[in-house]
C-alpha cells in the first residue's frame, strides 16, 4: 500500500532550470539578452533616430503647404502617424533591456504598445485614401476638378484616423500588466484569459483589415492605374512602377512577420513549444514592423534624388519638391508631374 512519506523527502528530482526551482536561488536567472531581443534593440534605436528626425522634417515641410496642397495633407498625416509611434520606442527599448520587465504602469501598458497598431491602421487607411485619390485623378479627372479639395482631404483623413482608433480598441482593452512572482517581474501583454475564440477573432480581423484586404485592394488599384498609364504612354511610367512597388511592398514586407506570428500564436496553446519560440521572436517582429515608421522619409529622399537629380539640394528643399507638388487634374499630366508623390504614398499604412 502506498503511503505518504514527508519525513525525509528527496528534493533531487525537483528540477526546473528556468524558474521556481527549489534548488536554484532567486538570483540564478540569466542576465543575458537573447539574440532576437538584441536585434530588436538595434532596430528600435535606428528607427527612433531616423523616424523622429525624418518624420519631424516631413511634418515641418508639409505643415506649411497643407492649406493649399492636397498631397501635403496626405504626407503630413502619414508622418504624424509614424512620429507618434516613434515616441513609444524609448519605453519599449527600456522594457526589452530589462528582460521585458514593465515598470511603467497599467495605463502606459495599454497605450504605448498599441501605438504601433494605431500606426498600422492609420497608415493603411490613409494609404487607401491616397490610392483612391490617385485612382480618381487618373479615371475621373472631371470629378476631381469639381470636388477634389483640401476640405475633403481633411475629412477623409479624419475618417481614416477615427476608424484606426476604433480598430485599435480591442488591443487597447485586452492589454494588462501581470506581475510574476518568481523571478519578480512585471509584464505588459494581452490577456484574453478563457476566451481563445476572441483572441483568434482579434488576430484574424487584424490580419484581414490590416494586411490581406489592403494588399488585395491596393494591388488591384495600382494595377489599373499602371495599366492606364502604360496605355497612354505616360512619361516615366517605369519609374512610377518602381516607386509604387517599393512603397507598397515595404509596408507589407515589414508587417508580414508580425502578422504571421500573431495569427499562429492565436491558434496555439500558450504552453506549446512553437508558441514559446514565436514568443521569443515577438520583440523582433514588432521592431521589424516599426521600420515602417522610419521608411517613408527615406523613400521620399531616395525618390526625390532619383527623379529630380537634386543630390546637392538641401533636404527640406528636396522633400518640399517631392511632397508638395500638386497633382494636375489632366490625366496625362497627373502621372508626369506627380509621379513621385504617387509612389511616395508610402504604403506605410501597411
Amino acid at each position: 500500500m502506498d503511503s505518504f512519506n514527508y519525513t525525509t523527502p528527496d528534493y533531487g528530482h525537483y528540477d526546473d532550470k528556468d524558474t521556481l526551482d527549489l534548488n536554484t536561488p532567486v538570483d540564478k536567472t540569466s542576465n543575458t539578452l537573447r539574440v532576437p531581443d538584441i536585434l530588436a534593440l538595434v532596430i528600435f534605436a535606428v528607427v527612433f533616430l531616423v523616424g523622429v528626425l525624418g518624420n519631424a522634417l516631413v511634418v515641418w515641410v508639409t505643415a506649411f503647404e497643407a492649406k493649399r496642397t492636397i498631397n501635403a495633407i496626405w504626407f503630413l498625416n502619414l508622418a504624424v502617424a509614424d512620429f507618434l509611434s516613434c515616441l513609444a520606442l524609448p519605453i519599449l527599448f527600456t522594457s526589452i533591456v530589462q528582460h521585458h520587465h514593465w515598470p511603467f504602469g497599467g495605463a502606459a501598458c495599454s497605450i504605448l504598445p498599441s501605438l504601433i497598431l494605431l500606426n498600422m491602421y492609420a497608415s493603411i487607411l490613409l494609404l487607401a485614401t491616397i490610392s483612391a485619390d490617385r485612382f480618381l485623378l487618373v479615371f475621373k479627372p472631371i470629378w476631381c476638378q469639381n470636388f477634389r479639395g483640401a476640405g475633403l482631404a481633411w475629412i477623409a483623413c479624419a475618417v481614416a484616423w477615427g476608424l484606426a482608433l476604433l480598430l485599435t480598441i480591442p488591443s487597447f482593452l485586452y492589454r494588462v500588466v501581470r506581475e510574476e512572482y518568481f523571478p519578480p517581474k512585471v509584464l505588459c501583454g494581452v490577456d484574453y484569459s478563457h476566451d481563445k475564440r476572441r483572441e483568434r477573432a482579434v488576430a484574424i480581423v487584424r490580419l484581414v483589415l490590416g494586411f490581406l484586404w489592403p494588399l488585395l485592394t491596393l494591388t488591384i488599384c495600382y494595377t489599373f492605374i499602371l495599366l492606364r498609364t502604360w496605355s497612354r504612354r505616360a512619361t516615366r511610367s517605369t519609374k512610377t512602377l518602381k516607386v509604387v512597388v517599393a512603397v507598397v511592398a515595404s509596408f507589407f514586407i515589414f508587417w508580414l512577420p508580425y502578422q504571421v506570428t500573431g495569427i499562429m500564436m492565436s491558434f496555439l496553446e500558450p504552453s506549446s513549444p512553437t508558441f514559446l519560440l514565436l514568443k521569443k521572436l515577438d520583440s523582433l517582429c514588432v521592431s521589424f514592423a516599426y521600420i515602417n515608421c522610419c521608411i517613408n522619409p527615406i523613400i521620399y529622399v531616395v525618390a526625390g534624388q532619383g527623379f529630380q537629380g537634386r543630390l546637392r539640394k538641401s533636404l527640406p528643399s528636396l522633400l518640399r519638391n517631392v511632397l508638395t507638388e500638386e497633382s494636375v487634374v489632366r490625366e496625362s499630366k497627373s502621372f508626369t508631374r506627380s509621379t513621385v508623390d504617387t509612389m511616395a504614398q508610402k504604403t506605410q499604412a501597411v
Epitope: 526546473d16 526551482d21 510574476e180 512572482y181 518568481f182 490577456d191
Partner: antibody
C-alpha cells in the same frame, strides 16, 4: 534538513499589534523568499506577501498592505511579520513558508486570537 | 487578482473510490518561461498544508502514484485513482505564477 519554527500563539485585544517570528534552518536563508499565508478558521488560505532577504525585496498582497509589515534578521535567519490595528477578522493561523516556488516547507503556524 | 474556483467544495467518497477535483483560474497561469505554476496541497486537521503536485502534473517526492494532476491554461484537475483513509482532508489548488498568489476555496474529501 529545512525547518521553519514559528513563535507560539497570541491573544491580543482589538486595535493592538502583534509580531510573530519564523526561524529558518537547513538552507541559505538569503537565497529564498520567505512568504506568509493566513488561514482563517475553517477557511481557505490567503497569501500576505513575501520578504526576500538577499535584496530586502518585499511584496504585499494589496489586501494586507499597510496592515502587515514583513522584516527579517539575517544574523539569526529569522523572519518576522507584524500585524497592526487588529480586528476580529484577523483571528487566524498565520504560516510562514519558504518561497521562490511551490511551498514545500511550511512553519507549524502561529494562532492569533483577537478578543476583547 | 487571479480567482481560483475549486469544485466541488465537498466530496464524499468510499475507500477505494476514484475522486476528481476541478480547479479553474480567472486568468491564464502560463508563466513567461512557458511553465504553468499550478500546485495542489493537502491539509489534514491541525497540520500545515503539504505539497502533493507541483506545476500542474508533477508528483512531489513521497506522494503515491494514485495522485495525478492534469490541465493547461486555466482548467486543471486533480485525480485520485483509489481513495485511502490517509487521503482524507482538504485539498487546495494554488497558483504561484502571478502576484498575489492565490488559493482555491478547498475541497473537503470525506467518507
Amino acid at each position: 534538513q529545512v525547518q521553519l519554527q514559528q513563535s507560539g500563539p497570541e491573544l491580543v485585544k482589538p486595535g493592538d499589534s502583534v509580531k510573530m517570528s519564523c526561524k529558518a534552518s537547513g538552507y541559505t536563508f538569503s537565497d529564498y523568499y520567505m512568504d506568509w499565508v493566513k488561514q482563517s478558521h475553517g477557511k481557505s488560505l490567503e497569501w500576505i506577501g513575501y520578504f526576500y532577504p538577499n535584496n530586502d525585496g518585499i511584496r504585499y498582497n494589496q489586501r494586507f498592505k499597510g496592515r502587515a509589515s514583513l522584516t527579517v534578521d539575517k544574523s539569526s535567519n529569522t523572519a518576522y511579520m507584524e500585524l497592526h490595528s487588529l480586528t476580529s477578522e484577523d483571528s487566524a493561523v498565520y504560516y510562514c513558508a519558504r518561497g521562490s516556488g511551490p511551498f514545500v516547507y511550511w512553519g507549524q503556524g502561529t494562532l492569533v486570537t483577537v478578543s476583547a | 487578482d487571479v480567482v481560483m474556483t475549486q469544485t466541488p467544495l465537498s466530496l464524499p467518497v468510499s475507500l477505494g473510490d476514484q475522486a476528481s477535483i476541478s480547479c479553474r483560474s480567472s486568468q491564464s497561469l502560463v508563466h513567461s518561461s512557458g511553465n504553468t505554476y499550478l500546485h495542489w496541497y493537502l491539509q489534514k486537521p491541525g497540520q500545515s498544508p503539504k505539497l502533493l503536485i507541483y506545476k500542474v502534473s508533477n508528483r512531489f517526492s513521497g506522494v503515491p502514484d494514485r495522485f495525478s494532476g492534469s490541465g493547461s491554461g486555466t482548467h486543471f484537475t486533480l485525480k485520485l485513482s483509489r481513495v485511502e483513509a490517509e487521503d482524507l482532508g482538504i485539498y487546495f489548488c494554488s497558483q504561484s505564477t502571478l502576484i498575489p498568489l492565490t488559493f482555491g476555496a478547498g475541497t473537503k474529501l470525506e467518507l
